[in-house]
Amino acid sequence: EYSNCGENEYYNQTTGLCQECPPCGPGEEPYLSCGYGTKDEDYGCVPCPAEKFSKGGYQICRRHKDCEGFFRATVLTPGDMENDAECGPCLPGYYMLENRPRNIYGMVCYSCLLAPPNTKECVG
């Protein structure tokens, strides 16, 4: 009856049709499962835990970028429940490679100990 319902659809026994799973709002993530024709009885949305964010819809909350610990960069904008953190310039003692393609996380800062001579962030 419902084998053709989509990834984010459940089968509504009242209408005989697939129906969109209720999407979550920004700062929320789905609790339990809904999709491909089925929906858990207690399916709903719950707020993102601390240090995580979500744009809403059906995505789970993701951890904020760790600007200082992972990227060795300053925090330009701290993340909240609805938005990821934004990283700023490198921390003191670190530099960013010029013309280096961004990886999936953005730009990564490297230790001045490994820098070529006269790298501007590392001079002085």
Epitope: E1, N4, C5, T14, T15, G16, L17, Q19, E20
Partner: antibody
């Protein structure tokens, strides 16, 4: 009297898009799902999908997921279907149909007159 | 998707004749709720389809009693006891037990 009034015929070029309307009257617009059905050149009928005018939620036949966009304007009690990247395969009559689901019945009880779409260069 | 097969595709009749149209589905149309969602629609020339019979055998409001539906599981029949001129057109069976809803290819009822 319950009526579904559809927009007039469309002649469109391949690759273009088209948006058709279905104006509902004589009943509570948000109380019934609105479905869209395709009929190619007097042949059989194909279910495209539906929209719930109450909340705008939609569900579509897998075959039309990249082709059709369904929307509503509650203030004017009008449903819309937009078809994109048109090819000759999209030349057809498109019907809107009201869906009844009281008492576990589930059928199309009122149909619009249809909009003829011709895709030609 | 559930395939609906109608026979015949064309049915020549004389006014006053009995007519019978068959519809077979590729899967059982008995829903888990116990209902069988097999409907019949008539499309008269130049018009949109109109509901005639819902859930196998229930006549929709305003449909004359010369129309009757029967069947179960995967095999269904629409009968017209005495064909009148206004009955001419294309008859479609349709299932709404499974998603997506599907229709038969249609049977054209026409004068001999």
């Amino acid at each position: 009297e319950v009526q579904l009034q559809q927009s007039g015929p469309e002649l469109v070029k391949p690759g273009a898009s088209v948006k058709m309307s279905c104006k509902a009257s004589g009943y509570s617009f948000t109380g019934y799902n609105m479905h869209w059905v395709k009929q190619s050149h007097g042949k059989s009928l194909e279910w495209i999908g539906y929209i719930d005018p109450y909340n705008g939620a939609t569900s579509k036949n897998q075959k039309f997921k990249g082709k059709a966009t369904l929307t509503v304007d509650k203030s004017s009690t009008t449903a819309y279907i937009q078809l994109n990247s048109l090819t000759s395969e999209d030349s057809a009559v498109y019907y809107c149909a009201r869906y009844y689901y009281g008492d576990y019945h589930w059928y199309f009880d009122v149909w619009g007159a249809g909009t003829t779409v011709t895709v030609s260069s | 998707d559930v395939v609906m097969t109608q026979t015949p595709l064309s049915l020549p009749v004389s006014l006053g004749d009995q007519a019978s149209i068959s519809c077979r589905s590729s899967q059982s149309l008995v829903h888990s709720n116990g209902n069988t969602y097999l409907h019949w629609y008539l499309q008269q020339p130049g018009q949109s389809p109109k509901l005639l019979i819902y859930k196998v055998s229930n006549r929709f409001s305003g449909v004359p009693d010369r129309f009757s539906g029967s069947g179960s599981g995967t095999d269904f029949t629409l009968k017209i006891s005495r064909v009148e001129a206004e009955d001419l057109g294309v008859y479609f069976c349709s299932q709404h037990t499974h998603v997506p809803p599907t229709f038969g290819a249609g049977t054209k009822l026409e004068l001999k």
